[in-house]
Interface confidence: medium
């Protein structure tokens, strides 16, 4: 992408001058001068630069994820564009730069215990005796091995309840679904009147841990029913 | 057209050395994993090594590591298979494959016609 | 290490018949941070270069027919061949890559499609 063409430090991912990827004919984008990217940075022209065509966050470079140039454009054409940096919007993990992850729709800084600053390749060991570590192409899109194996943490995206760690639960939090700590007694749960109604939820809560039940706080029976508080109860 | 050329097989006593080429044209050699996958007469697939589009990591199977060195010329389009130390059971034909991504390597989308291996006395 | 299990490891089909393949994985290769299964098919025929046939457990590959389709998650997956054609009798594997910090690659043993 063109910041990571700017970038000093990218120089070994510089995507070809002329033509696309293999197995996407014809699908290379030229960059307009002074275009602004979702990443919301300006970049100058580069003459002879046209950004990478992809169809998948895993064909572009490590410093890169794969999307539309602009947002709500032509889904069709999609080009590899700069990772954003810490504090910036997202909405997956490729998003963010290395060293970083997607937590409630923003890029935020792994820390040791979470993501391990890896694309796909999370071999940050060495190989054989040389004790080189990996190269820049192998550094953000997977948990790392002990990731995989404790499943996802706070905070990462996920499909179903069985992709996050034990006491947490998949649940909505905007347009995506991420892993939220179960309920613990006394915090405020959500009782669904109507079945299906917690599709309506964009910041969806988990459900009460065990040997709890999500009931009325004894406090607001006098309450009116709409303003009555539920909260997370021995059985 | 994607195309991968390999070369350097022949048959070799145990114990030698033998170095394998792949040319590689018809795509942006430098953005993709590459990978050796080798095939034992009668016997099915089995991943030997993969290396990563700056050559900077390089993964190898267990029964070749320390053995085999996987290297790349992206300026000449070509990968290597540096194998030492070579044994009857490294007999098999040696693929040379192209993988479909820059940072996932497993998926072989182009594969070389291969070139045998014999390793024996 | 991961280990890929394919099953049946022969079988014997009619053209026109429908074809299931199973392989399972000794661990799941349910990515959650890309939110994929990485799984691949390949299809090889005697004497040729193996061909990707379905990659990320459901996309088919470039050129493949659509009878050729990929389904399965977590560490049991499936290849289907809806209607059995006499160029589809050749032998399959299926691959993924090992959860471990090496990712190494690991293919099934292989199903061998022969003709009833």
């Known amino acids: 992408t063109l910041n990571s063409v700017l970038n000093s430090n990218a120089i070994k991912n510089l995507p070809p001058p002329l033509g696309g990827a293999a197995g996407h004919p014809g699908s290379a984008v030229s960059a307009a001068p002074g275009i602004l990217y979702p990443g919301g940075n300006k970049y100058q022209t580069i003459d002879n630069y046209q950004p990478y065509p992809c169809a998948e966050d895993e064909e572009c470079g490590t410093d890169e994820y794969c999307a539309s140039p602009t947002r709500g454009g032509d889904a069709g054409v999609q080009i590899c564009l700069a990772c954003r940096k810490r504090r910036k919007r997202c909405m997956r993990h490729a998003m963010c730069c290395p060293g970083n992850y997607c937590k409630n729709g923003i890029c935020v800084s792994s820390d040791q215990n979470h993501f391990r600053g890896e694309i796909e390749e999370t071999i940050t060991e060495s190989f054989g005796n040389d004790h080189s570590t990996l190269d820049g192409y192998s550094r953000r899109t997977t948990l790392s091995s002990k990731m995989y194996h404790t499943k996802g943490q706070e905070g990462s995206v996920c499909l179903r309840s069985s992709d996050c760690a034990s006491g947490l639960c998949c649940a909505r939090h905007f347009w995506s679904k991420i892993c939220k700590p179960v309920l613990k007694e006394g915090q405020v749960c959500t009782k669904h009147r109507r079945k299906g109604s917690h599709g309506l939820e964009i910041f969806q809560r988990c459900y009460c841990g065990e040997g709890l039940s999500c009931r009325i706080q004894k406090d607001h029976h006098q309450a009116s029913n709409s303003s009555r508080l539920h909260t997370c109860q021995r059985h | 057209e994607v195309q991968l050329l390999e070369s350097g097989g022949g048959l070799v006593q145990p114990g030698g050395s033998l170095r394998l080429s792949c040319a590689a044209s018809g795509f942006t050699f430098r953005r993709y994993v590459m990978g050796w996958v080798r095939q034992a007469p009668g016997k099915g697939l089995e991943w030997v090594s993969g290396?990563?589009?700056?050559?900077?990591?390089?993964v190898y199977a267990d029964s070749v590591k320390g053995r085999f060195t996987i290297s790349r010329d992206n300026s000449k389009n070509t990968l290597y298979l540096q194998m030492n130390s070579l044994r009857a059971e490294d007999t098999a034909v040696y693929y040379c494959?192209?993988?479909?991504?820059?940072?996932?390597?497993?998926?072989?989308?182009?594969w070389g016609q291969g070139t045998l291996v014999t390793v024996s006395s | 290490d991961i280990q890929m299990t394919q099953s049946p490891s022969s079988l014997s089909a009619s053209v026109g018949d429908r074809v299931t393949i199973t392989c399972t994985s000794s661990q799941s290769l349910f990515n959650v941070r890309s939110q994929k299964n990485y799984l691949a098919w390949y299809q090889q025929k005697p004497g040729k270069a193996p061909k990707l046939l379905i990659y990320?457990?459901?996309k088919v590959a470039s050129g493949v027919p659509s009878r050729f389709s990929g389904s399965g998650s977590g560490t049991d997956f499936t290849l289907t061949i809806s209607s059995l054609q006499p160029e589809d009798f050749a032998t399959y594997y299926c691959?993924?890559?090992?959860?471990?910090?090496?990712?190494?690659?690991?293919f099934g043993q292989g199903t061998k499609v022969e003709i009833k």
């Open positions: 494959a192209k993988d479909r991504y820059s940072q996932v390597h497993y998926a072989l989308d182009y």
């Open positions: 290396i990563y589009p700056s050559g900077g990591s390089t």
């Open positions: 691959s993924s890559r090992d959860n471990s910090d090496n990712h190494l690659v690991v």
């Open positions: 990320d457990t459901s």
